[in-house]
């Protein structure tokens, strides 16, 4: 697998690997159009979770505000559906016992926002 | 910072840290409504980039198909805007020289999908 050494090499001691300090492109930032979460026809709210032993410590989850979508009159149209857009992302967990610190990757599912779709089936007429 | 040991502890040798093998929740998968990228009123296409020295090797980027949004008649409505939704994610870079393998985190900006918004300004009438 990705994290294993080639078979011809001696195995990794203690089931751990070398992680270089520093993050490539650490200062790169998401740039999104202003207030899209409230201007979207499938608007959403954000919830922030905070964990000091995780990098990044702050993970933001979106929740769609409506089941339907918002029409030009600002009313909910239940002939259309607001659906979440999800993304798998990696975070790093820090584990420490005294001065012995190790890190482990963790996969997290993040809901990034919502989009308005034509329904496959109409539950609500 | 997150990756530094407490000040009272001896410094990390060679500027590297211990990364435990294995990924927490590795088998967790995104579960999204079927074909939302083509059913959305702000539809998008996917482009896949592949890099064997990156984990995950496959990174998928979305590209909004239209500048406007698709209305109930399937026509483009330029009074509304399709906008990309971005997310910062971490990937792991593998660097090897012979049997010496090390890893480094990298921040990547991923466009996850698109949403339809009421414009702030109208470039096109």
């Amino acid at each position: 697998t990705f994290f294993q050494k080639p078979e011809s090499c001696p195995p990794v001691p203690g089931g751990s690997m070398k992680l270089d300090i520093g993050i490539i492109n650490e200062n790169q930032r998401v740039s999104m159009s202003r207030n899209i979460e409230s201007r979207s026809t499938s608007p959403w709210d954000y919830t922030v979770t905070w964990d000091p032993n995780r990098y990044p410590s702050e993970v933001v989850q979106a929740q769609c505000r409506n089941l339907g979508c918002i029409n030009a009159q600002g009313k909910e149209d239940i002939s259309m559906n607001s659906v979440p857009i999800q993304q798998e992302t990696l975070v790093v967990r820090r584990k420490h016992q005294g001065c012995s610190v190790s890190f482990q990757l963790e996969k997290v599912l993040v809901t990034v926002g919502c989009t308005c779709v034509t329904p496959v089936i109409h539950h609500v007429q | 910072t997150f990756f530094q040991k407490p000040e009272s502890c001896p410094p990390v040798p060679g500027g590297s840290m211990k990364l435990d093998i294995g990924i927490i929740n590795e088998n967790q998968r995104v579960s999204m409504s079927r074909n939302i990228e083509s059913r959305s009123t702000s539809p998008w296409d996917y482009t896949v980039t592949w890099d064997p020295n990156r984990y995950p090797s496959e990174v998928v980027q979305a590209q909004c198909r239209n500048l406007g949004c698709i209305n109930a008649q399937g026509k483009e409505d330029i009074s509304m805007n399709s906008v990309p939704i971005q997310q910062e994610t971490l990937v792991v870079r593998r660097k090897h020289q012979g049997c010496s393998v090390s890893f480094q985190l990298e921040k990547v900006l991923v466009t996850v999908g698109c949403t339809c918004v009421t414009p702030v300004i109208h470039h096109v009438q």
Epitope: - | D45, Q61, Q63, R65, N66, V124
Partner: nanobody
């Protein structure tokens, strides 16, 4: 840092044509919708045309009325503006820029513009 280099401007007679080019470097070109803008003498900068991320969708300002065509070549990281049936009122400095949010991009939010290319329509 993104670099935008516009070229192809010049002096042309009314009814004539020009093809403007804009070479983009310093970022992933295909990740952005692209646009052309212009600043007529003594006026504010205004939107001219936009092309979507994939190149499959284009939009134009009202004054264009089927005279201009925007296109892109992702392999060359270049966006073009073919200008036909030029009028004296098309005289301006023409600029290109990325439109990260498509038509939702606001001109006042741009940190950087190229030097532009001067188009003069006169007999």
């Amino acid at each position: 840092q993104v670099q935008l280099v516009e070229s192809g401007g010049g002096l042309v007679q009314p009814g004539g044509s020009l093809r403007l080019s804009c070479a983009v470097s310093g970022r992933t070109f295909s990740s952005y919708a692209m646009g052309w803008f212009r600043r007529p003498p003594g006026k504010e900068r205004e939107f001219v045309a936009a092309i979507s991320w994939s190149g499959g969708d284009t939009k134009y300002a009202d004054f264009v009325t089927d005279r201009f065509t925007i296109s892109r070549d992702d392999a060359k990281s270049t966006v073009y503006l073919q200008m036909n049936s030029l009028k004296p009122e098309d005289t301006a400095v023409y600029y290109c820029n990325d439109m990260p949010y498509g038509l939702d991009t606001r001109m006042d939010e741009y940190e950087y513009w190229g030097q532009g290319t001067q188009v003069t329509v006169s007999s």
